[in-house]
């Protein structure tokens, strides 16, 4: 677990959990055939999702210099997606069964974010957009978009933790 003062997180644990997240994100949103919903109006919903960008210090040099910038960015993203996955977008219709990988994904996002959150220290979290789609087709479209961007996010996070586990672990 990360501790105050910018100590390193448990890189290996984070690596394992982020790999699990990658697997879950793909099983929650496998490649669907032609999506008849795609043309149904493109809300700006997923424009605000967190992305890991060049300035976030997640490159090998940035991680060596001060991994906290990158870890904070990853933490923000995990909390953002965890809130989205617990929202009406995923709890409303179309109904998800209790064995859905979305449920496991939700729990794993929370687990990894807790590994990164320093004790007694609260990183700023990003506001999630207030989305309350009323129609099942709107919800389903949002699910697919959110899961697609989550796949990209956790893929980058997993690479960061793999690099950290290989080169930065004590």
């Amino acid at each position: 677990r990360a501790v105050p003062g910018g100590s390193s997180p448990a890189w290996t644990q984070c690596q394992q959990l982020s790999q699990k997240l990658c697997t879950l994100a793909w099983s929650a949103h496998p490649l669907v055939g032609h999506m008849d919903l795609r043309e149904e109006g493109d809300e700006e919903t997923t424009n605000d999702v967190p992305h890991i960008q060049c300035g976030d210090g997640c490159d090998p040099q940035g991680l060596r210099d001060n991994s906290q910038f990158c870890l904070q960015r990853i933490h923000q993203g995990l909390i953002f997606y965890e809130k989205l996955l617990g929202s009406d977008i995923f709890t409303g219709e179309p109904s998800l069964l209790p064995d859905s990988p979305v449920g496991q994904l939700h729990a794993s996002l929370l687990g990894l974010s807790q590994l990164l959150q320093p004790e007694g220290h609260h990183w700023e979290t990003q506001q999630i957009p207030s989305l309350s789609p009323s129609q099942p087709w709107q919800r389903l479209l949002l699910r697919f978009k959110i899961l697609r961007s989550l796949q990209a996010f956790v893929a980058v996070a997993a690479r960061v933790f793999a690099h950290g586990a290989a080169t930065l672990s004590p």
Epitope: S27, S95, L97, P98, P101, L140
Partner: antibody, heavy 120, light 107 residues
Framework: QVQLVQSGAEVKKPGSSVKTSCKAS????????IHWVRQRPGQGLEWMGY????????KYNENFKGRVTITADKSTSTAYMELSSLRSEDTAVYYC?????????????WGQGTLVTVSS | DIQMTQSPSSLSASVGDRVTITCKAS??????VAWYQQKPGKVPKLLLY???TRHTGVPSRFSGSGSRTDFTLTISSLQPEDVATYYC?????????FGSGTKLEIK
């Protein structure tokens, strides 16, 4: 490959109960919902409910007005469906089915069905 | 409950014909619709899910389309082995419901 094997045919009197079983193999029993669907003679399909063995939580089709009880025995990887206060209209083939692992309820695996005949 | 109104209830067509079965949901189900084939005396078999995605091993002559309330199953070139009853199924809302079935025969 998941396989579902159901118990044999039953003949029951009106007003009585029937309990049919569905034994699953080839998958992780606790990790998937097991659904029950019935088909009356010459009729369509009717979803009755499911059980999620991991936490023993069932969900029912309220159209059965509390007559259906779905349970699971994790030790034997078997799900059960009990229907009470039987009437002649309950004569049907009762199937257990397991959906895809995506978390949505399209049914990939089906048991062979159990014919329940309700007759005086 | 969401009603799935399927039509026609039965149809007879010749080998090689293009066959279309429709299903209308009583309210929006997005694309949360599956189609099953049930041959006489057999168990239902999944053909399509998400309205248009073919299940593993299903021949390409079977296709589906539609969203929200109107859905279609099409068999592009009818084969003798396609004689069966076809059911649509919505898995958007509890209780999950099925269409009443379309019995397909060969002329």
């Amino acid at each position: 490959q998941v396989q579902l094997v159901q118990s044999g045919a039953e003949v029951k009197k009106p007003g009585s109960s029937v309990k049919t079983s569905c034994k699953a193999s080839g998958g992780t029993f606790t990790d998937q919902t097991i659904h029950w669907v019935r088909q009356r003679p010459g009729q369509g399909l009717e979803w009755m409910g499911y059980i999620y063995p991991r936490d023993d939580s069932p969900k029912y089709n309220e159209n059965f007005k509390g007559r259906v009880t779905i349970t699971a025995d994790k030790s034997t990887s078997t799900a059960y469906m009990e229907l009470s206060s039987l009437r002649s209209e309950d004569t049907a083939v009762y199937y257990c089915a397991i959906p895809d692992r995506s978390g949505y309820a399209w049914f990939i695996y089906w048991g062979q069905g159990t014919l329940v005949t309700v007759s005086s | 409950d969401i009603q799935m109104t399927q039509s026609p209830s039965s149809l007879s067509a010749s080998v090689g014909d293009r066959v279309t079965i429709t299903c209308k949901a009583s309210r929006d189900v997005a694309i949360a619709v599956a189609w099953y084939q049930q041959k006489p005396g057999k168990v239902p078999k999944l053909l399509l899910y998400w309205a248009s995605t073919r299940h593993t091993g299903v021949p390409s002559r079977f296709s589906g389309s539609g969203s929200r309330t109107d859905f279609t199953l099409t068999i592009s070139s009818l084969q003798p082995e396609d004689v069966a009853t076809y059911y649509c199924h919505q898995y958007s809302s509890y209780p999950f419901t099925f269409g009443s079935g379309t019995k397909l025969e060969i002329k």
